[in-house]
Interface confidence: low
């Protein structure tokens, strides 16, 4: 057949769905690869064709849209499973074409099993709540388009294995789950089960997300440099190793890029000729406040190096700070037998 623009296997969209639940999967061509939508393509006379490759097979085959109860169907640019089966796992391709144009993309679909406590290999989205910040809500995700607005589903929320009822600070409100005041104890996996009727059948949608309680912006401060500080002097003799830690505390800030770096005589270490290495370590508190340590190391320091200015810098969305390390050359201790003896009048 004629050439087709093949976007390959789009592994960025690793789609995971639960076994025995409905799934609606949009053709990624219109969302990520083409500059026009399905309606435009359809009105221009282009046809959307679906096919798949089963797990552990190489053979591409058409999707069977003639299964009992229309278990698999296509509607516009959406592929529907009502419901999925475990052996639906595979790579799915949607191809848009007419006699002169062709474009296609493949994507992996994994049908996943869950246990009675909703544990599964599913990758869970993380929702961050600010600690003690007032009422915050999470919403049952990815349920749009499964049923019309005229259908009123029932929604049940769970924390781990336990149905949420009579929790003192967590209240189910339909598609939303409200946290009256988020605390560390609210960390965990939350699941909403949406049940709705369709054509005389009952379907369930299970959605699990991880809640992580993080530091509140009310308490956020600019970075704090704990080291270097005014109390520690790095006193070295030429030839010794110079080690200066830069330890910085960062409040948790959503989407903030925390940075720590050293300058030596106002330049980045990379831009200077001395043999300097910098090692970084990062640790986090329970509320995702961050402590970064960058250790500046000069294996054999020279007297020139001991005259330089070593400045630790830190930056977050809250501001930028800097602190110079106190570095000086150690004055050699007097040799008793010569200098001190001479001082006492010995000959």
């Amino acid at each position: 057949s004629e050439r087709c623009d093949d976007w390959g296997l789009d592994t960025m969209r690793q789609i995971q769905v639960f076994e025995d639940e409905p799934a609606r999967i949009k053709c990624p061509l219109f969302e990520h690869f083409l500059k026009f939508n399905y309606s435009t393509a359809h009105s221009a006379g282009l046809t959307l064709i679906w096919y798949w490759t089963r797990q552990d097979r190489d053979l591409e085959e058409p999707i069977n849209f003639r299964l009992p109860e229309n278990r698999i169907s296509k509607e516009k640019d959406v592929l529907w499973f009502r419901p999925t089966l475990l052996n639906d796992t595979g790579n799915y391709t949607c191809m848009l074409r007419n006699t002169t144009y062709c474009s296609k993309v493949a994507f992996p679909l994994e049908v996943v099993q869950k246990d009675s406590c909703f544990n599964s290999p599913m990758k869970l989205p993380v929702h961050k709540l600010y600690i003690e910040y007032g009422i915050q809500r999470i919403t049952c995700p990815n349920v749009d388009g499964y049923f019309p607005s005229s259908v009123k589903p029932t929604i049940t929320w769970y924390m781990g294995c336990y149905k949420i009822q009579n929790f003192n600070n967590v209240i189910p409100e339909g598609m939303n789950l409200s946290f009256l005041i988020a605390l560390i104890s609210n960390n965990g996996n939350y699941t909403c089960v949406v049940t709705y009727p369709e054509n005389g059948r009952t379907f369930h949608l299970t959605r699990t997300l991880t809640v992580k309680v993080v530091g509140s912006p009310k308490n956020a401060v600019p970075p704090v440099i704990h080291s270097p500080n005014d109390h520690v002097v790095y006193e070295k003799e030429p030839g010794e190793e110079l080690l200066i830690p830069c330890t910085v505390y960062f409040s948790f800030l959503m989407d903030s890029r925390n940075e720590v770096w050293w300058t030596i005589d106002g330049k980045k270490p990379d831009d200077i000729t001395i043999d300097v290495t910098i090692n970084e370590s990062i640790s986090h508190s329970r509320t995702e406040d961050e402590t970064r340590t960058q250790i500046l190391s000069i294996k054999k320091v020279t007297s020139e190096d001991l005259k330089r200015s070593y400045v630790c810098h830190a930056r977050s969305a809250k501001g930028e700070v800097a602190k110079a390390a106190k570095v000086k050359q150690k004055v050699p201790a007097p040799r008793y037998t010569v200098e001190l003896a001479c001082g006492f009048g010995a000959t």
């Epitope: 890029r257 770096w261 330049k267 969305a317 501001g319 930028e320 110079a324």
Partner: antibody, heavy 120, light 110 residues
Framework: EVQLEQSGGGLVQPGGSLRLSCAAS?????????RCWVRQAPGKGLEWVSC?????????YYANWVNGRFTISRDNSKNTLYLQMNSLRAEDTAVYYC???????????WGQGTLVTVSS | DIVMTQSPSSLSASVGDRVTITCQAS??????LAWFQQKPGQAPKLLIY???TLASGVPSRFSGSGSGTEFTLTISSLQPEDFATYYC????????????FGGGTKVVIK
């Protein structure tokens, strides 16, 4: 009211010196902020000159073109920022602004500006 | 050294217009960019920092976007008091910046 009040500008001959002052009122210059100087030649754009990190007085930065001719400093007891300018040239003629902010460049407080004219 | 290229250098617009000013950095500065407004005879005023965060007291018609090397300042509906010159300032995190201001964009009445 929080403000920065500038002084020290004027006419100076090429090769001469001048010291600009920027007095802070309503807040302390010794708090952990960046204090900087920015200049603007007549009819031209803004140009960064120098910064000092007020949380630790020994951290200072200069634009490359300064080339050792200017020195930024501060006096906590007077709550004042200074720019000592030596070996002045005609191209240093500009309005000089002092500015302050929590980040290097995020200047939310500015002085009113002071005109420095270098001419014979 | 970092170079900030701002465009256009001037633009004429009417009250109520949507105005967009762009700034391009010569290297990746992440979201470390500020926008300033300056009126004749006055000191600059901070509008936006961290590329998109509105400074205190700045009207919501001003917005900033972008990261890396491409940045945009948008005024959604130009008001009479917005006719001024606008500057971007690329904040090179490792403070070896020279002149990190853009050349300025003068917004004049059409």
């Amino acid at each position: 009211e929080v403000q920065l009040e500038q002084s020290g500008g004027g006419l100076v001959q090429p090769g001469g010196s001048l010291r600009l002052s920027c007095a802070a009122s309503g807040f302390s210059l010794s708090t952990s902020y960046w204090r900087c100087w920015v200049r603007q030649a007549p009819g031209k754009g803004l140009e960064w000159v120098s910064c000092i990190y007020a949380g630790s007085g020994d951290v200072t930065y200069y634009a490359n073109w300064v080339n050792g001719r200017f020195t930024i400093s501060r006096d906590n007891s007077k709550n004042t920022l200074y720019l000592q300018m030596n070996s002045l040239r005609a191209e240093d003629t500009a309005v000089y602004y002092c500015a302050s902010g929590v980040g290097f460049g995020y200047f939310n407080l500015w002085g009113q500006g002071t005109l420095v004219t270098v001419s014979s | 050294d970092i170079v900030m290229t701002q465009s256009p250098s001037s633009l004429s617009a009417s009250v109520g217009d949507r105005v967009t000013i762009t700034c391009q950095a010569s290297e990746d500065i992440y979201s470390n960019l500020a926008w300033f407004q300056q009126k004749p005879g006055q000191a600059p005023k901070l509008l936006i920092y961290d590329a998109s965060t509105l400074a205190s007291g700045v009207p919501s018609r001003f917005s900033g976007s972008g990261s890396g090397t491409e940045f945009t300042l948008t005024i959604s509906s130009l008001q009479p008091e917005d006719f001024a010159t606008y500057y971007c300032l690329g904040v090179y995190t490792h403070i070896s910046a020279d002149n990190a201001f853009g050349g300025g964009t003068k917004v004049v009445i059409k």
